[in-house]
Interface confidence: low
């Protein structure tokens, strides 16, 4: 979680003298409570957009939208504090509005926007916005909340932000996987165009249930800047396990720009004559995780071959 | 050079807090996944957390699970470990640790230690 | 969750040794195992990772097999510099488990 650097935040604007200050997410009326406070945000709402640094990198932003009710308790609001948690992490960021002239009408409905949070692709998040001052321990609550969902990098606006493009959103590997006789699978995808190695990982599946039966790790080694945007092919020998026929076929890329956490894509070969919806795998993990979920071999014997070439 | 510089350990209660920083360097921290990995006195190696490069996969062994918070900072190329409810049990020297592309741990820092007693 | 166990728990031998020294998971892990050597008093390093892949710079007297269940760390000649505790570690789910390790010293 971070804020957007350029260009700086306002706050102020007609009728109202305001600037934004970095916050430690503990307002001082939190340990001083004040007898006054004022009502909670109406209408708040959040929504993704996108914005660009100064060295002309694009984020996706949190844009944080909310109202004043038209109640007297304005003449008691000294600012708000916009707080986001991601909820994976309980990384939680605060800005605070620090109004420096008292709001005394409702002319029009007061309107507060606030655009600079930098929101991570497939992340969700606890956006909140407290009045201040906060209310006395007892008092009735003056803040609102909402939950916020970052799409992931598949989605389109997404997938040429900055954070996206690292992870190697743009690589589109058209991975085909077919079955070949004597318990093999051919596997085919284009090469990015990049000197980089990457992994096969297959995991097979009886049919209709989650638990693997079969794992197996293929490094390919990285192609020569001739072979860039080819097709490499890929021979994958499967066990010969009874009812092992669901396989799922995971490409992970090494790109510099994301190494270990790049955007994995997978591919499914269903049961023959048994139409079968597997699980998705997540295409967005670490290194060390082929897939969620506990390990359950039904063979030990795991000793998959398996060989490749790079197709002109 | 490639460095990884653990600090924040000390004596603490049973029951107190502690958090532990690792500083990175020479590599692009962003890219990388993180580990915290301890040592009790005398014992072997224990893994006790994972963070993927932007914090969208986090794992903790179940002895932790609940107490500490593994976090990364990857403007300041920083790695945390936040831990409460401390336990004599988690006495130990505790390393943060880099996972290698293709597998393993292939750096790790010095440690730094955890002391719980009253 | 996956246990590591390794054998033996310590051994002694003199240099120029053959040393063996085995892993097994409680299930099957495909080849997502590293070895890791650790001297007295200071951090673990990595030796060979994807169960046979040796790491960059570590000598070729260090060698590793298997796959699935089963893996040996093998030391073809041992030097007294190889003095040090092994670890195994399983690396394809979490928790990312480490064997109890092998205490290796010279006879």
């Known amino acids: 979680l971070r804020l957007l650097d350029f260009p700086a935040p306002v706050c102020a604007q007609e009728g109202l003298s305001c600037r934004v200050k970095n916050s430690t997410c503990l307002d001082d009326s939190w340990i001083h409570p004040r007898n006054l406070t004022p009502s909670s945000p109406k209408d708040l709402q959040i929504q993704l957009h996108f914005a660009h640094t100064q060295q002309g990198d694009l984020f996706p932003v949190a844009h944080i939208e909310w109202t004043l009710q038209t109640d007297a308790s304005i003449l008691y609001l000294e600012g708000a504090e916009l707080s986001v948690l991601q909820l994976n992490t309980n990384e939680r960021l605060c800005v605070r509005f620090e109004f420096l002239s008292k709001l005394r009408h409702h002319h029009r409905r007061w309107r507060f926007t606030f655009s600079h949070f930098v929101v991570d692709p497939d992340q969700e998040y606890e956006v909140t916005v407290h009045h201040l001052p906060k209310p006395i321990p007892d008092g009735d609550p003056n803040h609102q909340s909402k939950n916020f969902l970052v799409p992931d990098c598949e989605h389109a606006r997404m997938k040429v932000t900055t954070p996206c493009m690292s992870s190697g959103s743009l690589w589109d590997p058209n991975i085909t996987v077919e079955t070949l006789e004597a318990h093999q699978l051919r596997v085919s995808f284009t090469l990015w165009n990049e000197s980089t190695h990457y992994q096969i990982l297959l995991t097979s599946f009886p049919h209709m249930e989650n638990h693997s039966c079969f794992e197996h790790m293929h490094h390919i080694p990285a192609p020569r800047p001739e072979e860039f945007h080819q097709r490499s092919n890929v021979t994958l020998t499967l066990r010969n396990l009874k009812g092992c026929c669901r396989h799922q076929v995971q490409i992970q890329p090494f790109f510099s720009s994301c190494l270990n956490d790049c955007l994995r894509h997978s591919a499914t070969v269903s049961c023959p004559e048994m139409p079968d919806t597997p699980e998705p795998i997540p295409d967005y993990m670490p290194l060390w995780e082929p897939r969620s979920g506990s390990s359950d071999y039904k063979d030990d014997d795991d000793k998959g071959s398996s060989h490749h070439h790079h197709h002109h | 050079e490639v460095q990884l510089v653990e600090s924040g350990g000390g004596l603490v209660q049973p029951g107190g807090s502690l958090r532990l920083s690792c500083a990175a360097s020479?590599?692009?921290?962003?890219?990388?996944?993180m580990n915290w990995v301890r040592q009790a006195p005398g014992k072997g190696l224990e893994w006790v957390s994972f963070?993927?490069?932007?914090?969208?996969?986090?794992y903790y062994a179940d002895s932790v699970k609940g107490r500490f918070t593994i976090s990364r900072d990857n403007a300041k190329n920083s790695l945390y470990l936040q831990m409460n409810s401390l336990r004599d049990e988690d006495t130990a020297v505790y390393y943060c640790?880099?996972?290698?592309?293709?597998?393993?741990?292939?750096?790790w820092g010095q440690g730094t230690t955890v002391t719980v007693s009253s | 969750d996956i246990q590591m166990t390794q054998s033996p728990s310590s051994l002694s031998a003199s240099v120029g040794d053959r040393v063996t020294i085995t892993c097994r998971a409680s299930?099957?892990?495909?080849?997502?195992l590293a070895w890791y050597q650790q001297k007295p008093g200071k951090f673990p390093e990595l030796l060979i990772y994807?169960?046979?892949t040796l790491q960059s710079g570590v000598p070729s007297r260090f060698s590793g097999s298997g796959s699935g269940t089963d893996f040996t760390l093998t030391i073809s000649s041992l030097q007294p510099e190889d003095v040090a505790t092994y670890y195994c570690?399983?690396?394809?789910?979490?928790?990312?488990?480490f064997g109890p390790g092998t205490k290796v010293d010279i006879k």
């Open positions: 640790a880099r996972p290698k592309v293709g597998g393993g741990m292939d750096v």
């Open positions: 020479g590599f692009t921290f962003s890219s990388y996944s």
């Open positions: 963070i993927s490069a932007r914090s969208s996969t986090i």
């Open positions: 299930q099957g892990i495909s080849n997502y």
């Open positions: 994807a169960a046979s």
């Open positions: 570690q399983k690396y394809n789910r979490a928790p990312f488990t």
